[in-house]
């Protein structure tokens, strides 16, 4: 059997830092037999067997033009084996980021931080903490460490599914290469990397005869479980087209009607979503959708009041108890002062 | 010569926006995390933002964090740190840093002046 | 974020004492501490990595050492060229921070 313990990465390749000395084995030989050492296609005698080094090859302060194939040799000229040497770095611990749309699963994404210039691959693993007492903390089965799966292709990145909502976990992603490993623990919990996607379907309608309404409505986002323990809060802005400034108002359900458009001009709209609780942050922008209010005179049946969901002109309370799950069904209001003085408008 | 040179600061109103640049030579850039360190006049270092090789995963301190973007171009061995809505807190000295890994600095420009003030 | 505390905040020490700084992390760091040394209107330099691994070309009067939360710098015997400030800084964590600093200068 070969004196020489076969590194991770490819056969027939071996390792060494720059800078460092390095040591190349002979495979083909039975440790500490004498060899003779020359450099592929070069004749020059690099190590006679005189040595008192067996079966290796020292090289001391290595750079990149020691890298390339080697051969040895026995006494007997017959061939010792072929090795080529790569040079690189140990790992450096890879930074690690996770984040959940759901309130189920989440994922976590790496990268080097130092190119080794090696091969690398990367384990990916997790436990879920389990803090027992004041300051004690236990391991059981149920804790794990788990595998976390990683995506196929070599895209760099694990998905934790079935993962609870309230629980602690530490993620462990450990770069490995032929010089080395080096870990990367990351404390994460759901509550704070819960980042929803976008709410869907977002559309801008007119509320015909009425020329500073808009009503918008949209969806959950697909991600978000569809029996959802967890609710969304939304939160819409709207602007005239070219106006620099956003409105923000945060609707009660899955559509608002803007009481305060500006007449004849289209209105970009947009909607983020976020857990009905606090929990994590916001969801990014969904993709705009624009409307234009009605320019047309008040339809001959003016729509029941309950029919039109527009919000309170007092700014919504943020830390007002959560509301039940959100409901399409528009809460009945009376008429306010803008809508009589939208009317006066409309009807002069 | 291994050497970091930055560049681009000056003084700036409050709410203005500058971009800092910082240029590597004589290591091979793309192989290494980058860094933003500040030093406030008379102050003590405060880390401000870091980015791996690839630039896929960047890191902001708190302070700096939706104002400031950090990003690197590999082919110009350039790292730049774009400071936007600047405040008078964030006057400093602005210094680029190497690698080797992630937090740990073993390589260091000159610093750049970067003054808010109206 | 991982919060670090250096004392003394300054000293003054004569030419040959043996100095030395300690840095204290709120929470286990393991070793993953370094120690800076910053001259007046310089840059920081490297000293000590990994809280006790010398630096090439840093002189061998410089030593770390500690793991976990407690850290100490030595300077064995304290020369001119060493008036600076001397900063302790994690890297644990994935957002580094630095101690506040100590001043050292020569009685």
């Known amino acids: 059997s070969s004196p020489c313990p076969q590194a991770w990465g490819p056969p027939g390749v071996q390792y060494g830092q720059p800078g460092r000395s390095v040591k190349l084995c002979c495979p083909g030989v039975t440790a500490g037999d004498p060899v003779s050492w020359f450099r592929d296609g070069e004749p020059k005698l690099l190590q006679g067997p005189d040595s008192g080094l067996g079966h290796e090859l020292v090289l001391a302060q290595a750079d990149s033009t020691d890298e390339g194939t080697y051969i040895c040799q026995t006494l007997d000229g017959a061939l010792g084996g072929t090795v080529t040497l790569q040079l690189g770095y140990p790992p450096a611990r890879p930074v690690v980021s996770c984040q959940a749309a759901d309130y189920e699963n989440f994922s976590c994404t790496w990268s080097p931080s130092q190119i080794s210039g090696l091969p690398t691959r990367y384990l990916t693993s997790y436990r879920k903490k389990t803090v027992l007492g004041a300051d004690s903390q236990r391991r059981s089965p149920s804790t794990g460490p788990w595998p976390c799966p990683q995506d196929p292709l070599g895209a760099a990145r694990c998905v934790v599914h079935g993962a609870e909502f309230w629980s602690q976990y530490r993620i462990n992603v450990t770069e490995v290469n032929p010089l080395g490993a080096s870990t990367r623990l990351l404390d994460v919990s759901l509550q704070s990397i819960l980042r929803p996607d976008p709410p869907q379907g977002l559309r801008v309608e007119s509320v015909p005869g009425y020329p500073r309404r808009l009503r918008a409505s949209w969806t959950y986002p697909a991600s978000w479980p569809c029996q959802p323990h967890f609710l969304l809060k939304f939160r819409l802005q709207y602007r005239p087209a070219q106006h620099p400034a956003w409105s923000t108002v945060e609707p009660a359900g899955l559509e608002e009607v803007i009481t305060d458009a500006v007449a004849g001009l289209p209105h970009a709209v947009r909607v983020s979503a976020r857990d009905f609780l606090d929990a994590g942050t916001w969801s990014t922008w969904s993709p705009e959708a624009w409307g234009t209010p009605s320019t047309g005179t008040i339809p001959k049946e003016i729509p029941a009041w309950g029919q039109l969901h527009t919000q309170p002109e007092v700014e919504p309370q943020v830390d007002s108890p959560a509301p039940p799950r959100p409901s399409l069904q528009p809460h009945p209001r009376l008429l306010d002062h803008r809508d009589s003085v939208e009317q006066v408008a409309v009807l002069a | 010569e291994v050497q970091l040179l930055e560049s681009g600061g000056g003084l700036v109103q409050p709410g203005g926006s500058l971009r800092l640049s910082c240029a590597a030579s004589?290591?091979?850039?793309?192989?290494?995390?980058m860094t933003w360190v500040r030093q406030a006049p008379g102050k003590g270092l405060e880390w401000v933002s870091s980015?791996?090789?690839?630039?896929?995963?960047?890191q902001y301190a708190d302070s700096v964090k939706g104002r400031f973007t950090i990003s690197r171009d590999n082919s110009k061995n350039t790292l730049y740190l774009q400071m936007n809505s600047l405040r008078a807190e964030d006057t400093a000295v602005y210094y680029c840093a190497k690698g080797p890994g992630w937090g740990s600095f073993d390589l260091w420009g000159r610093g750049t002046l970067v003054t808010v003030s109206s | 974020d991982i919060q670090m505390t250096q004392s003394p905040s300054s000293l003054s020490a004569s030419v040959g004492d043996r100095v030395t700084i300690t840095c204290q992390a709120s929470q286990d760091i393991n070793n993953y501490l370094n120690w800076y040394q910053q001259k007046p209107g310089k840059a920081p330099k490297l000293l000590i990595y990994d809280a006790s691994n010398l630096q090439t070309g840093v002189p061998s009067r410089f030593s770390g050492s500690g793991s976990g939360t407690d850290f100490t710098f030595t300077i064995s015997s304290l020369q001119p060229e060493d008036i600076a400030t001397y900063y302790c800084s994690q890297f644990e964590s994935q957002s580094p921070t630095f101690g506040p600093g100590t001043k050292v200068d020569i009685k």
């Open positions: 004589g290591f091979t850039f793309s192989w290494y995390s």
């Open positions: 980015i791996v090789p690839s630039g896929g995963h960047t």
